[in-house]
C-alpha cells in the first residue's frame, strides 16, 4: 500500500535534526575592524564630518573574534531559531585552494569555516561539513582544475584528496560528520556530451571520494573519530502504469542508473551494478549506443569497496517513469526512461511532486540492497512561493517525516538523521529556504521546531525528554576545551 495511516512515536535521542545549506562563501576579512584599530579619533561632527586621528594616543585592541564576521552572526541567529542539533554546510574548494593544490592555501577562508563550526558548537549545534558541492550553474572547482577538463581528468581526484586532507587537518577536531561530495550522480547534467564523458567523470568522482575516505581512515580517524560518506541524489521511482511490466523494469532501472551506479561500488562490490553494465552493453551490441561503463581494475575495486561510514541520501520527490527506447550515446538515452508528470499530485512551483511514501520505499530499498547500515537523509525539502506562511513546506515536512518515522519504527531502518533543505533561499532561485534571501523567518520554522522538540509525533502522554548521558557530557566538555585551546 502506498499511503498508510500516520503513526505516533518518536525518533531516538541521538537522532540528528538538521538543516542544510549549500556552499558558504567565506568572508575574506572580518567585517568589524573597529576593534583592531588602536587609534583614537575625534569626529568633526559639525564641520567636515570626518574622523581625525588623535596623534600619540594608542588604545588597547581586542583580539579578532569569530562573530566579527557579519554573515556568521546572521547564520547563528537563523540556526538558533531553527533549534536544530546539526548544521550541514559546504566549503568552497575554489576559495580554500585557488590554485587547486597546496601551494597556495587560503588560511583566512579556513579560519572563517572554523569559526562557523566553533560558534555553532557554542549553541549546541554540530556541523556536518561537505567538502565539495557542485551545482549546475557553478562547478565549484579551482580554475586550474576546471581548465584541465575538471572531472574528466583523473588528476582532479588526486587534487581532491589533497584538499580533503587539508580540511580534515584544519577542521577535523571539531567536525565529526563529513560528506566528501554532494550528489556526484547529478554531475551527469554537466558531463553530458556523451555517455562516456558521464561515466568517465563519475569514475573519477568515485575515486576522489575513495581516496579521501582512505586518507581519513588511515591518518585522521584514530584521533578525530569522525565518519565520512558522500551524499547521493536519491529520488524514488514508481512505474507510471503499475500494470505494465516494462514500467516496473524502468523504475528499477532508474534506481540502478541513479543510485546503484555510485552505491554499488562503494557500499558493496567495488564495481558498477551488473544490471547497469549489462543494459548499456546490450544497447551497444545492438548499435543503439556507443557508451560503455569503465572497466575497473582489481586495484580500483579494492580502492572503492567499503569506503563509506554511513549512507547519505538527498531525497526530494518520487518520479513516475515508463520505458521508452531511445537511440543516442548519452547517459539520458542509455537509460531508456521517460518521465511522466502526474498532474493530479500536489506539486511545487518547480513541479516537484509531494509523494511522502516514496521516502519510506527508498529507505527500504536501500536496506534491502546494501544491508543494515546507518542512514542519514542529508537534504530533503520543497520550494514554496510563500514568503511567510509556507504551508506547502509545513505539509511536506510533516508528511515526509511521518514516512521516515514509519521506516524507523515499523521497518526498523537505522535512520540516524534528517536534514531539511535549506536554511536560507537565494535571490531569484526556487524558494527552498526556511528564511527568505533577506533573512526573514517563515512559519515552517515553528513547525519544524515543534517536531524537533517532540522528537517526532509522540503520544499525548509520552515524554520528549532525553536523559543527558555521561558520555554526552564528557563530549561537550571536550569540545569546550578544544575551543578554549590557544
Amino acid at each position: 500500500k502506498e499511503s498508510t495511516p500516520d503513526v505516533q512515536g518518536q525518533f531516538p535521542c541521538d537522532f540528528s535534526w538538521g538543516v542544510t545549506e549549500s556552499v558558504l562563501k567565506p568572508e575574506s576579512v572580518a567585517s568589524s575592524p573597529q576593534f583592531s584599530d588602536p587609534h583614537l579619533y575625534v569626529w568633526n561632527a559639525t564641520g567636515n564630518r570626518l574622523l581625525h586621528r588623535v596623534e600619540g594616543v594608542r588604545l588597547k585592541t581586542r583580539p579578532a573574534q569569530c562573530t566579527d564576521f557579519v554573515n556568521i552572526k546572521k547564520q547563528l541567529e537563523m540556526l538558533a531559531r531553527m533549534k536544530v542539533t546539526h548544521y550541514r554546510f559546504a566549503l568552497d574548494w575554489a576559495s580554500v585552494l585557488p590554485t587547486g593544490n597546496l601551494s597556495a592555501v587560503n588560511r583566512q577562508a579556513l579560519r572563517y569555516y572554523r569559526c562557523v563550526v566553533s560558534e555553532g558548537l557554542k549553541l549546541g549545534i554540530s556541523a556536518m561539513v561537505t567538502l565539495y558541492y557542485p551545482t549546475h550553474a557553478h562547478l565549484g572547482l579551482p580554475e586550474p582544475l576546471l581548465h584541465a577538463d575538471g572531472w574528466l581528468n583523473p588528476s582532479t581526484a588526486e587534487a581532491f584528496q589533497a584538499y580533503a586532507g587539508l580540511c580534515f587537518q584544519e577542521l577535523g577536531d571539531l567536525v565529526k560528520l563529513w560528506i566528501t561530495i554532494n550528489e556526484p550522480n547529478r554531475l551527469s547534467d554537466i558531463y553530458n556530451r556523451s555517455g562516456n564523458d558521464t561515466y568517465g567523470a563519475a569514475h573519477n568522482l568515485l575515486v576522489a571520494h575513495a581516496l579521501a575516505w582512505r586518507l581519513y581512515d588511515r591518518q585522521f580517524r584514530p584521533s578525530q573519530r569522525g565518519a565520512v560518506s558522500l551524499s547521493l541524489h536519491a529520488d524514488w521511482a514508481e512505474p507510471a502504469n503499475p500494470y505494465a511490466d516494462s514500467h516496473w523494469r524502468a523504475a528499477e532501472r532508474f534506481l540502478q542508473f541513479e543510485i546503484a551506479w555510485f552505491a554499488e561500488p562503494l557500499f558493496k562490490t567495488g564495481d558498477y551494478p551488473a544490471a547497469m553494465r549489462e543494459y548499456i552493453a546490450s544497447k551497444h551490441r545492438r548499435g543503439l549506443s556507443s557508451s560503455a561503463l569503465p572497466r575497473l581494475t582489481e586495484a580500483e575495486r579494492r580502492l572503492l569497496k567499503g569506503t563509506v561510514d554511513f549512507c547519505a541520501l538527498n531525497h526530494f520527490t518520487t518520479r513516475f517513469v515508463m520505458h521508452e527506447q531511445l537511440a543516442g550515446s548519452r547517459y539520458d538515452s542509455d537509460r531508456d526512461i521517460q518521465f511522466l508528470q502526474d498532474i493530479t499530485r500536489l506539486s511545487s512551483p518547480t513541479r516537484l511532486a509531494v509523494i511522502p511514501w516514496g521516502v519510506r520505499k527508498l529507505l527500504r530499498w536501500v536496506r534491502r540492497n546494501y544491508g543494515d547500515m546507518d542512514i542519514y537523509i542529508t537534504a530533503s525539502g520543497i520550494d514554496d512561493q510563500a514568503l511567510e506562511d509556507d504551508r506547502l513546506r509545513k505539509y511536506y515536512l510533516g508528511k515526509y517525516l511521518q514516512e521516515v518515522l514509519k521506516a524507523y519504527l515499523i521497518d526498523k531502518v537505522r535512520i540516524k538523521g534528517y536534514y531539511a533543505f535549506k536554511l536560507a533561499e537565494e535571490k531569484s532561485k526556487p524558494r527552498f529556504g526556511f528564511f527568505t534571501s533577506d533573512f526573514k523567518a517563515k512559519s515552517s520554522i515553528q513547525f519544524y521546531n515543534k517536531v524537533i522538540s517532540s522528537r517526532g509525533f509522540p503520544f499525548e502522554n509520552s515524554s520528549s525528554r532525553c536523559s543527558q548521558t555521561q558520555e554526552n557530557t564528557e563530549c561537550t566538555v571536550c569540545l569546550f576545551l578544544v575551543q578554549k585551546k590557544p
Epitope: 584541465a148 575538471g150 574528466l152 558531463y191 556530451r193 556523451s194 562516456n196 564523458d197 568517465g200 550515446s329
Partner: antibody
C-alpha cells in the same frame, strides 16, 4: 597525448572551394569543440568558429557565416572546414585547435596549420 | 564583439631584462584571458590561462596578471628563445577574440 593533424597546403584559383581536414587523436573526439582560426600576415589571429563533432552543433563568427562550413566525421575522428568562393582575402594559414571541456575558447592543442594560397 | 587591443606591435628587449606586454578588452571579460606564444613558422602555444595561471611546462619567468579589462603578460629574465609574437585572447564570450599581437625582438 592529444594531437591534431591537418591536411597539406593548398594552391587554389579564385572562385573555387577548398576543404581542410583536421584529424584528432588521443581524446574523445565527439566531446570537445574543435575551433578554427585564420592567420594572415600582419592581421594576427582571427577566430572563425567552432563545431562540436558529436552533435554537429556549430557556431560561426558573423563575417564567416557564408564563407566557412564546418563538418565532422566521428567514425574517423576528423573535422573539416570548407571555404567557398575563394578570393585573395582568403589567402592565409588556417589552424584547427581543440578547446578545454569547460572552456572551449581556451585553445590548448593546435594543428600545424594549413596554408591556403588563392591565386589566378 | 569584444575587441582586444595590444597597443604595442613591437617591443625590443635584451636577454636578462624584464618586459611587460599589455592587452585591453573593450568590455569586462572577468579573468577569462589567455596568452599564446607564436614563434616564426610554428603554431601558437598556450602560455597563460585565466589571466594568471601558467600552463603546464611553461617556465615561471612568464607571469600573467589583471582582470576585468586590463591584462599584462610579464617576462622576467628574458631569454633568447623568447623571441616570438605574443597574443592575448578573451574566451569569456563567443566570438572568442584575439589581440593584434606583440612581437618581441631581442637586441
Amino acid at each position: 597525448q592529444v594531437q591534431l593533424q591537418q591536411s597539406g597546403d593548398e594552391l587554389m584559383k579564385p572562385g573555387a572551394s577548398v576543404k581542410i581536414s583536421c584529424k584528432v587523436t588521443g581524446n574523445t573526439f565527439s566531446s570537445y569543440w574543435i575551433e578554427w582560426v585564420k592567420q594572415r600576415p600582419g592581421h594576427g589571429l582571427e577566430w572563425i568558429g567552432e563545431i562540436l563533432p558529436g552533435s554537429d552543433s556549430t557556431k560561426y563568427v558573423e563575417k564567416f557565416k557564408v564563407k566557412a562550413t564546418f563538418t565532422a566525421d566521428t567514425s574517423s575522428n576528423t573535422a573539416y572546414m570548407q571555404l567557398s568562393s575563394l578570393t585573395s582575402e582568403d589567402s592565409a594559414v588556417y589552424y584547427c585547435a581543440r578547446g578545454g571541456y569547460h572552456y572551449p575558447g581556451w585553445l590548448v592543442y593546435w594543428g600545424q596549420g594549413t596554408l591556403v594560397t588563392v591565386s589566378a | 564583439d569584444i575587441v582586444m587591443t595590444q597597443s604595442q606591435k613591437f617591443m625590443s628587449t635584451s636577454v636578462g631584462d624584464r618586459v611587460s606586454v599589455t592587452c585591453k578588452a573593450s568590455q569586462n571579460v572577468d579573468s577569462y584571458v589567455a596568452w599564446y606564444q607564436q614563434k616564426a613558422g610554428q603554431s601558437p602555444k598556450p602560455l597563460i590561462y585565466s589571466a594568471s595561471y601558467r600552463f603546464s611546462g611553461v617556465p615561471d619567468r612568464f607571469t600573467g596578471s589583471g582582470s576585468g579589462t586590463e591584462f599584462t603578460l610579464t617576462i622576467s629574465n628574458v631569454q633568447s628563445e623568447d623571441l616570438a609574437e605574443y597574443f592575448c585572447q578573451q574566451y569569456n564570450i563567443s566570438p572568442y577574440t584575439f589581440g593584434g599581437g606583440t612581437k618581441l625582438e631581442i637586441k
